[in-house]
Interface confidence: medium
């Protein structure tokens, strides 16, 4: 007995809705750059990530997650918003690229913000030249803030149990749907081989339906990939990756990245302290 395509489609749509609902729980963060997105060589830039109240970790990702920096030094931007600031003291050509924010608000990670492109240009005006584009953001307009020093950037947290269960659940359902689809397609093929359909209509319909289901499944899988599965990569401890994972691990030296995690306007002498380690190593999993 073959599964009814309508029931299958229902299951697929149900899965898609589940993933969609999980996404909608957390608002997307916004990202901006101060003093702007076009920065003269040698000048400083501060990325401002903003999300809702209750954020425990903000992450600034660079060039599609190949490098990232976390901070738990989250400031209150307003009674309903929180923010974190990531500062690069002396911008180099290597700092140019696409940046975006993501945050962890228990028990899950948010979607990513829009990308913000940082452009680095040669400048004759020197490091303090005000020759920058005005503050630019992806998302709501941002503002200057907290004039103190972020003293550290904690390592990213391990994959949460809740995330794991969701991922396993989604994967199992997805594989089950895929199996049903394959069986269904094989069944239809057998039917077609056995004899011609009774009408032209019937010849087309079975062909259309699985395609629709496959299309929905593909788009669902896409969503799961964008907002779910790579979180495993993002949250996996670098030590765990290094200690015998089947993935090949590359340690990228992020000297050029040199996020010093300091805020835009240094007020006290304390805020001139560098991070404990200015050269950061990030584990980049290559599949």
């Amino acid at each position: 007995m073959s599964p009814h395509p309508t029931a299958l489609l229902g299951l697929v749509l149900c899965l898609a809705q589940t993933i969609h609902t999980q996404e909608e729980d957390l608002p997307r963060p916004s990202i901006s750059a101060e003093p702007g997105t076009v920065i003269p060589l040698g000048s400083h830039v501060t990325f401002v990530c903003r999300g809702p109240v209750g954020v425990q970790t903000f992450r600034l990702e660079r060039d599609s997650r190949s490098t990232y920096n976390d901070t738990e030094d989250v400031s209150q931007a307003s009674p309903s918003e929180s923010e974190a600031r990531f500062r690069i003291d002396s911008v180099r050509e290597g700092n140019a690229g696409l940046y975006r924010c993501i945050y962890y608000k228990p028990p899950k990670w948010s979607e990513q913000s829009d990308y913000l492109e940082l452009l680095v240009k040669e400048s004759s005006g020197g490091p303090d030249s005000p020759d920058t584009e005005p503050g630019s953001s992806a998302g709501p307009t941002q503002r200057p803030s907290d004039n103190s020093h972020n003293e550290h950037a904690p390592a990213s947290q391990g994959l949460k149990a809740e995330h794991l269960y969701i991922l396993i659940g989604v994967s199992v359902v997805f594989l089950f749907c895929l199996l049903l689809l394959v069986l269904f397609c094989l069944h239809r093929q057998n039917q077609i081989k056995q004899g011609p359909p009774r009408s032209k209509d019937e010849e087309q319909k079975p062909q259309q339906r699985p395609d629709l289901a496959v299309d929905v499944l593909e788009r669902t899988a896409d969503k799961a990939t964008v907002n779910g599965l790579p979180e495993k990569d993002r949250e996996t401890d670098t030590s765990a990756l290094a200690a015998g994972s089947s993935q090949e691990v590359t340690y990228a030296q992020l000297d050029h990245w040199a996020l010093t995690q300091r805020t835009a306007r240094a007020v006290s002498p304390q805020s001139t302290k560098p991070m404990a380690e200015s050269i950061t190593y990030a584990a980049v999993a290559r599949h």
């Epitope: 307003s78 200057p144 004039n147």
Partner: antibody, heavy 113, light 108 residues
């Protein structure tokens, strides 16, 4: 419902230290910052600083940097403010405020010899 | 530090009257402003966030407006329970968050 229960009135001598508490209930303590605000008799409100109970990170008004120390105990969902080297100027009502959307009832501190 | 100047410092108004309190910042604060009410002998209560967002549970007769350096709080129809001191609070640049000096509102 959200409640911030502050410790009772304190009477202290000049030069002494005092630790005020603010017990939170009705919400996830680590998800909201806790601010402390000072109000002298017949005067306005003055922001002292805040603590992020999750990370323990604090931010202070420069004016109170050497006066106040903010801490938080996640296990008891309680925020604390220690005031040191007390002077008569420290006599005031001190409020804790969750993100400025919920306020405690205030603790009256009287510094007197 | 950003200085917040409120006016008037005190005022009398009749029940049912429309009341407006203003607050001026020493620089542009990008609408990062809250309005806080303190009734006599009570702890403060936040009414408005982000210059015009009403906090949950606050009566709709309260409204906030403004941008840049100039902001105002309006009570559309004054009620007896609205008597108290109103403070504006900026959080555009911090530390420190700064409050205005307060406006004492009394019933005629």
């Amino acid at each position: 419902q959200v409640q911030l229960q502050q410790s009772g009135a304190e009477l202290a001598k000049p030069g002494a230290s005092v630790k005020l508490s603010c017990k939170a209930s009705g919400y996830t303590f680590t998800s909201y910052w806790m601010h402390w605000v000072k109000q002298r008799p017949g005067q306005g409100l003055e922001w002292i600083g805040y603590i992020n109970p999750f990370s323990g990170h604090t931010k202070y008004n420069q004016k109170f940097k050497d006066k106040a120390t903010l801490t938080a105990d996640k296990s008891s969902s309680t925020a604390y403010m220690q005031l040191s080297s007390l002077t008569y100027e420290d006599s005031a009502v001190y409020y804790c405020a969750r993100n400025f959307d919920q306020w405690g009832q205030g603790t009256t501190l009287t510094v007197s010899s | 530090d950003i200085k917040m100047t409120q006016s008037p410092s005190s005022m009398y108004a009749s029940l049912g009257e429309r009341v407006t309190i203003t607050c001026k910042a020493s620089q542009d604060i990008n609408s990062y402003l809250s309005w806080v009410q303190q009734k006599p002998g009570k702890s403060p209560k936040t009414l408005i966030d982000r210059a015009n967002r009403l906090v949950d549970g606050v009566p709709s007769r309260f409204s906030g407006s403004g941008s840049g350096q100039d902001y105002s709080l309006t009570i559309s129809s004054l009620e007896y329970e609205d008597m108290g001191i109103y403070y504006c609070l900026q959080y555009d640049e911090f530390p420190p968050y700064t409050f205005g000096g307060g406006t004492k509102l009394e019933i005629k």
